[in-house]
């Protein structure tokens, strides 16, 4: 058939690889778009075809699998570069088809240059380590499938530009890097260089990740509302602006959703008729603890508004808390001639 299910350009899978290194790229069809795997497709008589569009070109062309030393090859649903070149950058398409069925997807591949300190435009994965939490490890990522288990590669770890050896609390252990006790000073970029032989040639795989030391779960507490509190009274006259900040501290918790909200007389501000605005800002500490501030603002407060209950609520995976603001109407200063004179028995 002429028709082909075209999944378009899958920009979610922006693949970046280093120049002059091996790269193995799986066809995304089987991972994200189709309900069957390559083996099933192959046994059903479907063929996987690869082609590409060079950077800044519109013309789709077949991939040349007849380059010297099989620089580009295909194995099952994997496209191999041994190694990549800078001008391999472009959009790659894998198409699965037979006479009655067709499905294809394209994805961008960017070949990236790095300097001698492993700096590059590569987007780095972030690995979070808990502060002072005992031994934690990071593993050299995305090296599976490059060499058989019978091959024993050499692995060298770097922090920034420096080879990791005789570091106080960081120990290389093959594919793993162990942090005996993670500290803020361990924040930074870590690179593993994996060197392995293949068919008389030596290849290098460079993998860099960012280590971020974050708050430990053993130190985590439920949200702490710093404001409103019992020490502050919002005393206003009708017509004045009422500004009440709700400031909440959240301990870092992996995958926790931190929420702050106001209620006025038990209702969300959206559900009442007062002209109220809420502005939020968020700041983070070095260990990714979070301080959220929501400022509730009523431009011209009425005497009715000053009788309402204003409660700040906060929630995280550690629990939920709430605190009411102390709001009251300012008592006008007495006018001497009338009020005080009456007090002295004047008539």
């Amino acid at each position: 058939s002429e028709r082909c299910d075209d999944w378009g350009l899958d920009t979610m899978r922006q693949i970046q690889v280093f120049e002059d290194e091996p790269a193995r790229i799986k066809c995304p069809l089987f991972e994200h778009f189709l309900k069957f795997n390559y083996s099933t497709a192959h046994s059903a008589g479907l063929t996987l075809i690869w082609y590409w569009t060079r950077q800044d070109r519109d013309l789709e062309e077949p991939i040349n699998f007849r380059l010297p030393e099989n620089r580009i090859s295909k194995e099952k649903d994997v496209l191999w570069f041994r190694p990549t070149l800078l001008n391999d950058t472009g959009n790659y398409t894998c198409m699965l088809r037979n006479t009655t069925y067709c499905s294809k997807v394209a994805f961008p591949l960017e070949v990236v240059q790095k300097d001698s300190c492993f700096n590059s435009p590569m987007k780095l994965p972030v690995h979070k380590l808990y502060i002072e939490y005992g031994i934690q490890r990071i593993t050299c990522p995305n090296v599976d499938g490059y060499f058989p288990s019978s091959v024993k590669p050499t692995i060298t770890w770097y922090m920034g530009c420096y080879k990791i050896q005789n570091f106080n609390n960081v120990i290389p252990e093959g594919m793993n890097l162990s942090f005996l006790i993670a500290l803020i000073s361990n924040n930074g970029n870590y690179t593993c260089v994996v060197t392995y032989p293949e068919n008389g040639r030596t290849f290098h795989l460079t993998r860099t990740l960012t280590v971020k030391v974050v708050g430990s779960p053993k130190n985590a507490v439920p949200p702490v509302i710093h404001s409103p509190n019992d020490h502050v009274v919002y005393e206003k006259e009708p017509g004045e602006e009422l500004l009440i900040p709700c400031t909440v501290y959240f301990s870092f918790l992996m995958d926790s959703r931190n929420e702050v909200w106001w209620t006025i007389d038990g209702k969300k501000p959206d559900d009442i008729t007062i002209d109220v605005t809420i502005n939020e800002s968020i700041s983070h500490s070095r260990t990714e603890d979070e301080t959220r501030t929501q400022i509730l603002s009523i431009k011209k407060v009425t005497s009715e508004d000053l009788k309402r209950s204003y409660v700040c609520h906060a929630r995280s995976a550690k629990g939920e808390v709430a605190k009411a603001a102390k709001v009251k109407q300012k008592v006008p200063a007495p006018r001497y001639t009338v009020e005080l004179a009456c007090g002295f028995g004047a008539t």
């Epitope: 702490v224 009274v233 009440i244 900040p245 800002s281």
Partner: antibody
Framework: QVQLVQSGAEVKKPGASVKVSCKAS????????MNWVRQAPGQGLEWVGQ????????YYAQKFQGRVTMTVDTSTSTVYMELSSLRSEDTAVYYC????????????????WGQGTLVTVSS | DIVLTQSPISLAVFLGQRATISCRAS??????????MHWYQQKAGQPPKLLIK???DLESGVPVRFSGSGSGTDFILNIHPVEVEDIATYYC??????????FGGGTKLEIK
């Protein structure tokens, strides 16, 4: 970044008043307590009082009660400290200092300080 | 009012050695899970700088040679190894229960 910039040095006569300002920037001004701390020449630090800009709520050290007034102008993110009935022992550098927020519900530290304002009381 | 007593009043140590400053409160400044005691460094002609908050938590950007410990009424600031730029006066500070903050009398650190 957080900055606290104070007004310049003042020379006052005994019995007069002085008003020192502290302009804040780099954070949400109304949400942090602002403290005033003074330091007489060659002496230690002495807490004068504090103000919460969102509400104007103030707390003063017992020693300064009745002589000190702290005010705020939220439109310019500035706090003021006025000390009246000055005497020679009020000669000191006066610092404004912001209270921090942390995982605990009180007992706050002073995380940012102004550069200080020297107030000299002399006849 | 809680009174904070710092000792010694002055301290001279060799470069690279340990300096230990102690601060005693007239009553406990600790509660469930934290102590409301902080340490500041003040160099000549400069405002104080927060070093350690809540007895032992190092403030952002402060070198790890500074450490704090203690709870209840007895607290310690350690500097190890002491460096030339650590010459300063060190103050303990408690903020137990708004609205009263007090400071210790200060400890002057010098290099031998």
């Amino acid at each position: 970044q957080v900055q606290l910039v104070q007004s310049g040095a003042e020379v006052k006569k005994p019995g007069a008043s002085v008003k020192v300002s502290c302009k804040a920037s780099g954070y949400i001004f109304i949400t942090y307590w602002m403290n005033w701390v003074r330091q007489a020449p060659g002496q230690g630090l002495e807490w004068v009082g504090q103000i919460f800009p969102a509400s104007g709520t103030t707390y003063y050290a017992q020693k300064f009660q009745g002589r000190v007034t702290m005010t705020v102008d939220t439109s310019t993110s500035t706090v003021y400290m006025e000390l009246s009935s000055l005497r020679s022992e009020d000669t000191a550098v006066y610092y404004c200092a912001r209270t921090d927020f942390y995982r605990y519900d009180g007992g706050y530290a002073l995380d940012y300080w102004g550069q200080g304002t020297l107030v000299t009381v002399s006849s | 009012d809680i009174v904070l007593t710092q000792s010694p009043i002055s301290l001279a140590v060799f470069l690279g050695q340990r300096a230990t400053i102690s601060c005693r409160a007239s009553q406990s400044v600790s509660t469930s899970g934290y102590s409301s005691m902080h340490w500041y460094q003040q160099k000549a002609g400069q405002p104080p700088k927060l070093l350690i908050k809540y007895a032992s938590d190092l403030e952002s950007g402060v070198p790890v040679r500074f450490s704090g410990s203690g709870s209840g009424t007895d607290f310690i600031l350690n500097i190890h190894p002491v460096e030339v730029e650590d010459i300063a006066t060190y103050y303990c500070h408690h903020s137990w229960g708004i609205p009263m903050y007090t400071f210790g009398g200060g400890t002057k650190l010098e290099i031998k």
